[in-house]
Interface confidence: low
């Protein structure tokens, strides 16, 4: 389907897209979810822990699962990013297609905080993120190969 009026990413709720790598415009890192729950960025697209599954829970709202880690990206109440074994309310993000064709992922529970990576490859605290920052811009790339 076409992009919905609100500019959010449109794909059928409950359906999985193909696995993706989320490439961050800030430093060129791929979002990585480790089996121990740590979250960071890495430049090597061959790293198995950058393969992510995005699932729509409703229009424009996704959960982000690390395929190898079998964990879900979560934004904690103090702004930390980690990956949990179970889906919780902290695992839902508003996915939006920005005018520059990059995506942003904003926490549904903590609605002014975004998923973001620093230029060092570390994640950025949600409390330090905001619209317009390069750190919050991600380009979904196919990870089928």
């Amino acid at each position: 389907p076409a992009l919905p009026e609100d500019g959010g990413a449109a794909f059928p709720p409950g359906h999985f897209k193909d696995p993706k790598r989320l490439y961050c415009k800030n430093g060129g890192f791929f979002l990585r979810i480790h089996p121990d729950g740590r979250v960071d960025g890495v430049r090597e697209k061959s790293d198995p822990h950058v393969k992510l599954q995005l699932q729509a829970e409703e229009r424009g709202v996704v959960s982000i699962k690390g395929v190898c880690a079998n964990r879900y990206l979560a934004m904690k109440e103090d702004g930390r990013l980690l990956a949990s074994k179970c889906v919780t309310e902290e695992c839902f993000f508003f996915e939006r297609l920005e005018s520059n064709n990059y995506n942003t992922y904003r926490s549904r529970k903590y609605s002014s905080w975004y998923v973001a990576l620093k230029r060092t490859g570390q994640y950025k605290l949600g409390s330090k993120t905001g619209p317009g920052q390069k750190a919050i811009l991600f380009l979904p790339m196919s990870a089928k190969s």
């Epitope: 409950g14 829970e57 409703e58 709202v61 949990s84 179970c86 919780t88 839902f92």
Partner: nanobody
Framework: QVQLVESGGGLVQPGGSLRLSCAAS???????????GSWFRQAPGQGLEAVAA??????????YYADSVKGRFTISRDNSKNTLYLQMNSLRAEDTAVYYC??????????????????WGQGTLVTVSS
Amino acid sequence: QVQLVESGGGLVQPGGSLRLSCAASGTEDGRLLTLGGSWFRQAPGQGLEAVAAIGAGDRGGATYYADSVKGRFTISRDNSKNTLYLQMNSLRAEDTAVYYCTALYERQPQLAATKVARKWGQGTLVTVSS
């Protein structure tokens, strides 16, 4: 044990209407469907297709429709009855399928990080034929 039970399917002529219902029972907290509900369908020999969805929020939430049903199908819900609906008008032969409802629900709403689960119904057959 949370269960979703669909009803309202059956045989209808092209151009006719049906209203599917998806009733939830056995909820631990009475909040089933408030996180969002969807209708999917599976035609014979085909894959699962998302037909319509309604988002989170006690007062309704955003709706999603597949292009093939826009303007003909309407999704709604009644939280007081814990029921999800799909009103299907101007039915066509290609709408013939088993229709499934699915819902997200909170298992433990008192926790700061609420556990969320997805449930599926058993399906109801809709046949559009003259």
